[in-house]
């Protein structure tokens, strides 16, 4: 997260870290005791999932292995469309005040809605600085029409843009798959942005979760 702030401790109990060994690979969101939602581009053969801590590599955090993941069938590495994936945990999480599932959206929030994005991605760009603490940024949803002025045909129908006019605050490498939460519901998953990160008026781009609720529910049901 560029130009963000340290999240209030325990305020993001659904936030998970997908680790490759001990190293951050991507962010993710707990949606059920067995399931984590993340970006399709975060796909690996297996994952170490850290839950219940704002500190990356926290020894006291829950760590659960995951060996199965299900990318959206329409995902494209070329256009980045349908950048969404479900990761099935090998064992159920122990829910607590520090570990909770996020609420999936009932509807798509409108442009102008205030949201918070979080992650352990680099806080500087192009030189990288990975924080140990979970970082947050407050952003507003941007209409597809406005966002297309910047990204033209790169912006797919199920992509969501967020940012703050003239501000550098944005997502960056390592934040991928993490949550954009608006009015206590998951509206976006961090997908991509311009590089170097934090260029004013280049919105962050997210997968618009409200358009995938059916796919999420059906995939979880199929692979119970």
């Amino acid at each position: 997260i560029i130009d963000g702030y340290k999240c209030k401790e325990g305020s993001h109990p659904w936030q998970v870290a997908l680790l490759k060994g001990n190293q951050l690979h991507c962010g993710g969101v707990l949606v059920d005791k067995y399931w984590v939602l993340t970006a399709a581009h975060c796909k690996m053969g297996q994952y170490q999932v850290q839950l219940g801590s704002d500190k990356i590599g926290d020894q006291s955090a829950q760590k659960i292995k995951a060996t199965k993941s299900f990318r959206h069938p329409g995902y494209s590495t070329k256009t980045h469309v349908n950048d969404i994936m479900l990761v099935r945990l090998d064992e159920p999480v122990k829910m607590s005040s520090k570990v909770e599932a996020v609420q999936l959206p009932e509807h798509c929030e409108p442009p102008g809605t205030s949201c918070t994005v979080s992650g352990w991605g680099t806080t500087t760009s192009p030189d990288v600085t990975f924080p140990s603490d979970l970082m947050c940024s407050d952003v507003k949803l941007i209409s597809s029409r406005e966002c297309k002025k910047v990204y033209k045909d790169l912006l797919g129908k199920t992509m969501l843009c967020a940012g703050i006019p003239d501000s550098k605050t944005n997502t960056c490498n390592g934040d991928s798959g993490g949550p954009l939460v608006c009015n206590d519901t998951l509206q976006g998953l961090v997908s991509w942005g311009t590089y170097p990160c934090g260029q004013p008026n280049d919105p962050g781009v997210y997968t618009q979760v409200c358009k995938y609720k059916r796919w999420v529910m059906e995939t979880m049901k199929t692979h119970r």
Epitope: P126, V150, Y151, N173, S176, W192
Partner: antibody, heavy 128, light 107 residues
Framework: QVQLVQSGAEVKKPGASVKVSCKAS????????MHWVRQAPGQGLEWMGS????????NYAQKFQGRVTMTRDTSISTAYMELSRLRSDDTAVYYC?????????????????????WGQGTTVTVSS | EIVLTQSPGTLSLSPGERATLSCRAS???????LAWYQQKPGQAPRLLIY???SRATGIPDRFSGSGSGTDFTLTISRLEPEDFAVYYC????????FGGGTKVEIK
């Protein structure tokens, strides 16, 4: 294969403007920065600026601020460089060159910073 | 603005000899953001080295780059006839700048 094809040579009068085009093929145009570099006769390379084709964002060298405009048309994978208020010392070969990735995507945070593909160059002559 | 100074201005060597080209920055440059180019008369420049030491695609292994901070070096281990050209270093620190170039000519 990956290539950049530039528009033809131009002869301009002092005070006029010139617009050079650079058509990209063989790769995703919006995925990489496009730089413009010029070289006056017998001189070295001079970086003029760059454009991020994914967003249209630009970065110009101080020397050319206010005189150069870089744009892109993603529908035809083409970048443009317009230089106004031309002077005789703007006589040079103008190159477009592909730079590093223009978007971040995924966990990796290392990107190369080299101009790995160059156009053939466009000669601009400014003479009264 | 970071200024890059290349030396020597001209290097007169024979084929088979070793060429050592220097590039000095006016302030520290991250080695990730230093590149070297070769340019022959009437041609566009060609990327040789990026990230101070990584060879670009198709570049022979007689070309090598090294250095960090303010001092960087391009080495051509054994000069081939096609290596006689002008070499430029280039850095990125928000904005790009090129060095003035070193001409490698046949002695």
């Amino acid at each position: 294969q990956v290539q950049l094809v530039q528009s033809g040579a131009e002869v301009k009068k002092p005070g006029a403007s010139v617009k050079v085009s650079c058509k990209a093929s063989g790769y995703t145009f919006t995925g990489y920065y496009m730089h413009w570099v010029r070289q006056a006769p017998g001189q070295g390379l001079e970086w003029m600026g760059s454009i991020n084709p994914s967003s249209g964002g630009t970065n110009y060298a101080q020397k050319f601020q206010g005189r150069v405009t870089m744009t892109r048309d993603t529908s035809i994978s083409t970048a443009y460089m317009e230089l106004s208020r031309l002077r005789s010392d703007d006589t040079a070969v103008y190159y477009c060159a592909r730079g590093g990735p223009s978007t971040w995507y995924g966990g990796s945070a290392y990107y190369y910073y080299g101009m790995d593909v160059w156009g053939q160059g466009t000669t601009v002559t400014v003479s009264s | 603005e970071i200024v890059l100074t290349q030396s020597p201005g001209t290097l007169s060597l024979s084929p088979g000899e070793r060429a050592t080209l220097s590039c000095r920055a006016s302030q520290s440059v991250s080695s990730d953001y230093l590149a070297w180019y070769q340019q022959k008369p009437g041609q566009a420049p060609r990327l040789l080295i990026y990230g101070a030491s990584s060879r670009a695609t198709g570049i022979p292994d007689r070309f090598s780059g090294s250095g960090s901070g303010t001092d960087f070096t391009l080495t051509i281990s054994r000069l081939e006839p096609e290596d006689f050209a002008v070499y430029y270093c280039q850095q990125y620190a928000n904005l790009w700048t090129f060095g003035g170039g070193t001409k490698v000519e046949i002695k």
